[in-house]
Interface confidence: low
């Protein structure tokens, strides 16, 4: 004799009685009502099973919760299946295996015919494990269940001291959505709170669950995919008081089926977004949206923050939202970098995305603009990246290309080309009354718009001039003159410079910001704007900095243990950190401080200026680093503003240093030989570069490197170049991530040092 | 299963053209980089081309560059390699090989799936 | 763009374990880092032993071991098995699209 081999196959669902009703008692578990309408239903549910071919499989059930509208019950049962029937047993045929039972004309006098009239229809089955009920039964002791009527917000209160987890069972009408609210109000917290798409806890239909505050996301709202939603709130050690506030409602279901037809242009024309964007997007979305372009001359380009779309395996879900674009399927993921979905358009000029969730966990509400592109040429004078779908520049010594084709097949890299014989000048001696190519040709076309490319100045009326840097020279080289607009910047104060010296004098760096914390100087900025100081991300990485109530800002500061007249302070109305801010590969390494006053300019307070995207910071030139940081690895923050010169680093020089870990958006300066550095206490402080009209412009900014003047490892500094559109974005009120935006962080904001 | 399996090869006189053809199958073609790597008899390995699943990046040895096309068709599962101007030292064992499988949008530049090779002689 | 070098032959007795160099320049196995190596038996297609310098595809066993330096890079095949005996080859990306091979090298297991 060989004993069978069974499995314990959790089922866990629901059941509406149309001859019983809700009532308040019915909601609380500790009730006697509740206690005894709980053990009846579990009897109806038990003798019900136990009817169909089931029976013999019974091992135990538990009817755990009742909800509103005709007495609906909340259940789960075990059956002790043969090994063999595992697989054939699924909830939908255990779900049909009762619905028979309950339209049959059985003479039966089980609960279930005689005393309780039970909705067929409304019978759910779903699949539940052993894990999910330990869940749900350690939270019974704090189990609420409510109803969430329409137009309703209904708070939800934490755990109390006495109990750890608790569970809330939310229901709604059956033509909505739950839609649940969760608001951090503190910076450090380590409840959890998971929410599933299910009446309990059901690892399978889990949607979200977050742990630990989030900066990156202060609010976030989430939807189930119809009227039922579980929470379960889990206090985390010595936790006393609740981290966030959690509200819920029913909402409508709001449609995405979308018909457009666009415009002849190529700027951004609209977006398309999952219903209540930025909620998390429900587990039961169906997008469609129908586009057509004018013309086959266009193609559509969809453009993605921070999500990316590719390839998958077509036996594999899509975790994060499945896209069918032209019978191609394609599988979304987060990513802390831009991206483009480009859909040349051959035969037709529709086009349908479909965006569906193939699972119950979801993720924020996706957002795509659209434009359309040039088919024939989608990025003039850029390279595109097919790995991504941008345009970047080509040729100008940066991998921006994962791939690094945008650096292939160059005639010049970073150079200019002589028309004549592809000779390569350097692009400092292009416009410069000079010629330097055999017939002159760095010297046409000086005075008149060209074709935009990497190298090009683009004026405001988008017109492009071949003169690399021609900001704020004293020259109008553009039509418009924008190239001499805002240029209140990058002039010294004060111009007598211990030449070869360390130590600054007063005004020789009236841009230069101490960034403090009580008093203790952390990090150091610059000015750019009357209400702007730029900074590294990183400084904001700590959970205890992360507010921007902490810090005080100081400009004209020359001396960290005194005061002096030329110097003043302000403090921080807003912090945007880059929305790509990476802390462990320190990519996106950029954040910007709005002071709660604007900044009035004088000899030792000015703004640096801020370069186009198009400027040429050329490999080998001399610049220069400011700050309070250590002079030694190691060593305490200077109290003088201290001052060293160091030579831009060709990219693929220091990504080789870096093993590869230099991105586009960073730049390198100092010496192989090391000594020359910047160090801790110098993080965010300006890189700063002296162009022939005498105007200081803003290459980069001080964010990481293997420790401080090590031979062979150069600084690395956030390019400003690649961060600049963020930049202009936000200054000019566009976004960025405000109030903060930043993953969980754990280390010290200041020059990282490895 | 996995397999690619090559076609066309054959005794041709130099300066003639020849077209080989590599039918793929147990596998999603179109997620896949695709190449041709040639084998002289006793020799060593060399690789003659590579196209892209979007054929939107092509590249080519630069003993064939000019006279030899690759192209894929996506919808018959199938790569082609178009020889023209054939010379006596074209003559080897042409293998078709696969991208690794991985991630769609990432490159390996290396090959783990090859054909049994189709071989041509070009006679002079 | 020109074969990488590799030695014609390399021996072992079973057991033993054996290093195959394959040196390139500062433009293929320098810069890049996708060396690959292949393992070819007589009449047989190349078979994939090594990617990305040192990751190993499932079904490889781990005596088959890949690394780096400089412009080098170096295929270890320890406790070597007679099934070992076979040409093998390493490859690395070229930049602009190209792969470039090593003349390849014949293993022997002794005795």
């Known amino acids: 004799y060989k004993a069978e081999v069974t499995v314990s196959q959790v089922y866990s669902g629901s059941l509406r009685v149309l001859n019983r009703h809700f009532s308040q008692d019915l909601g609380r578990r500790e009730s006697i009502a509740f206690r005894s309408e709980s053990a009846k239903a579990q009897k109806m549910l038990q003798e019900l099973v136990a009817s169909t071919r089931l029976g013999t499989y019974y091992n135990s059930s538990s009817v755990y919760s009742f909800g509103e509208g005709p007495l609906t019950c909340f259940f789960w049962f075990i059956l002790d299946i043969p090994e063999y029937q595992r697989l054939t047993l699924s909830p939908e045929v255990v779900r049909e295996l009762l619905v028979d039972e309950l339209l049959s004309n059985s003479s039966t006098l089980a609960s279930y015919k005689t005393e309780y009239e039970v909705d067929p229809e409304g019978l759910v089955i779903l699949e539940a494990s052993v894990n999910d009920i330990v869940v749900l039964n350690s939270t019974l002791g704090c189990y609420r269940y409510s109803y969430v009527n329409p137009g309703q917000v209904l708070p939800l209160k934490g755990p109390d001291q006495q109990t750890t987890s608790c569970l809330w069972h939310l229901q709604g009408p059956e033509d909505l959505m739950i839609k649940v609210r969760l608001e951090w109000t503190r910076v450090d917290c380590r409840d959890r709170v998971a929410m599933y798409d299910a009446a309990g806890p059901l690892e399978k239909r889990l949607i979200t669950s977050v742990y630990g505050c989030s900066r990156q996301e202060p609010v976030m709202e989430v939807l189930a995919s119809g009227s039922v939603m579980a929470v379960v709130w889990k206090k985390g050690m010595h936790s006393y008081y609740d981290p966030f506030l959690l509200s819920v409602k029913s909402v409508a279901f709001q449609d995405c089926q979308v018909n457009l037809t666009l415009e002849g242009r190529l700027d951004t024309q609209g977006f398309l977004r999952t219903p209540y964007y930025p909620s998390y997007y429900s587990p039961s979305t169906h997008c469609s949206w129908h586009l057509t372009v004018p013309s086959l001359d266009y193609g559509l380009a969809l453009w993605f923050d921070a999500y990316a779309l590719r390839r998958q395996k077509y036996n594999r879900l899509c975790t994060q939202g499945q896209w069918m674009i032209q019978n191609r399927r394609l599988c979304g993921f987060r990513t802390l970098q831009p991206y483009a979905e480009r859909i040349p358009m051959v035969a037709s000029d529709g086009v349908t995305i479909n965006f569906t969730s193939q699972i119950s966990l979801t993720g924020p509400g996706v957002q795509v603009y659209y434009s359309l592109y040039n088919q024939s040429d989608p990025c003039p004078g850029e390279f595109l990246c097919s790995v991504n779908g941008l345009c970047v520049p080509a040729c100008d010594g940066i991998k921006d290309c994962p791939n690094g084709l945008d650096e292939r097949n160059c005639v010049c890299r970073a150079m200019f080309q002589c028309q004549e014989d592809s000779t390569c000048i350097s692009l400092p001696r292009v416009c410069d009354r000079q010629p330097d190519c055999l017939n002159g040709s760095d010297e046409e076309q000086c005075q008149e718009g060209v074709p935009c490319g990497t190298f090009t100045f683009q004026c405001e009326d988008r017109s492009c001039v071949k003169k690399p840097n021609p900001e704020c020279d004293g020259q109008s080289d553009c039509r418009d003159g924008s190239d001499e607009q805002h240029c209140d910047c990058g002039l010294q104060g004060l111009s007598s410079r211990i030449v070869g010296g360390t130590v600054s004098s007063e005004g020789e760096w009236p841009w230069q910001a101490s960034l403090q914390i009580r008093g203790r100087h952390i990090c150091g900025g610059a000015l750019i704007a009357d209400r702007w100081v730029i900074t590294a991300a990183h400084c904001f990485q700590e959970d205890s900095m992360a507010s921007p109530k902490l810090w005080t800002v100081f400009l004209g500061k020359m001396r960290q243990n005194s005061r002096w007249p030329g110097e003043v302070s302000f403090k921080v109305s807003r912090l945007f950190l880059h929305p790509y801010h990476e802390e462990d590969s320190h990519d996106y390494d950029v954040a910007l401080l709005q002071l709660d006053h604007p900044v009035v300019y004088s000899a030792t307070v000015r703004p640096v200026c801020l370069p186009a995207r198009s400027h040429f910071f050329e490999p080998g030139q001399h610049c220069w680093i400011t700050g309070w940081g250590a002079q030694r690895e190691g060593g305490p923050v200077s109290n003088t503003l201290q001052k060293v010169d160091v030579q831009l680093v060709p990219q693929d020089l220091c990504s080789e240093a870096y093993r590869y870990q230099v991105s586009p958006r960073m730049l390198c300066a100092g010496y192989r030989k090391g000594k020359k550095d910047a160090c801790q206490g110098d993080s965010g402080g300006p890189l700063v570069c002296r162009e022939p009209s005498g105007r200081w412009f803003l290459a980069g900014l001080v964010s990481w490197g293997l420790g401080c003047g090590r031979p062979n490892f150069f600084g690395v500094y956030t390019r400003v170049t690649r961060v600049i559109n963020w930049i202009q974005q936000v200054l000019t009120g566009g976004g960025g991530s405000g109030g903060g935006g930043s993953h969980h962080h754990h280390h010290h904001g200041s020059h990282h040092h490895h | 299963e996995v397999q690619l399996v090559e076609s066309g090869g054959g005794l041709i006189q130099a300066g003639r053209s020849l077209r080989l053809s590599c039918a793929a199958s147990?596998?999603?073609?179109?997620?896949?980089?695709m190449y041709w790597v040639r084998q002289i008899p006793g020799k060593g390995l060399e690789w003659i081309s590579s196209i892209t699943w979007k054929s939107d990046i092509i590249a080519y040895a630069d003993s064939v560059k000019g006279r030899f096309t690759i192209s894929r068709d996506n919808a018959k599962n199938a790569l082609y390699l178009q020889m023209n101007s054939l010379r006596a030292e074209d003559t080897a064992l042409y293998y078709c090989a696969r991208e690794k499988d991985g991630d769609f949008y990432y490159y390996y530049f290396a090959m783990d799936v090859w054909g049994q090779g189709t071989t041509v002689t070009v006679s002079s | 763009q020109s074969a990488l070098t590799q030695p014609p032959s390399a021996s072992g007795s079973p057991g033993q374990s054996v290093t195959l160099s394959c040196t390139g320049t500062?433009?293929?196995?320098?810069?890049?880092?996708?060396v690959s190596w292949y393992l070819q038996h007589p009449g047989k297609a190349p078979k994939l032993m090594i990617y990305e310098v040192s990751k190993r595809p499932s079904g490889v066993p781990d005596r088959f071991s890949g690394s780096k330096s400089a412009n080098t890079a170096s295929l270890t095949v320890s406790g070597l098995q007679a099934e070992d005996e076979a040409d093998y080859y390493c490859s690395s990306y070229a930049g602009s699209n190209k792969v470039v091979f090593g003349g390849g090298t014949k293993v022997t297991v002794l005795g």
């Open positions: 500062s433009s293929d196995v320098g810069y890049y880092n996708y």
């Open positions: 147990g596998f999603t073609f179109d997620e896949h980089v």
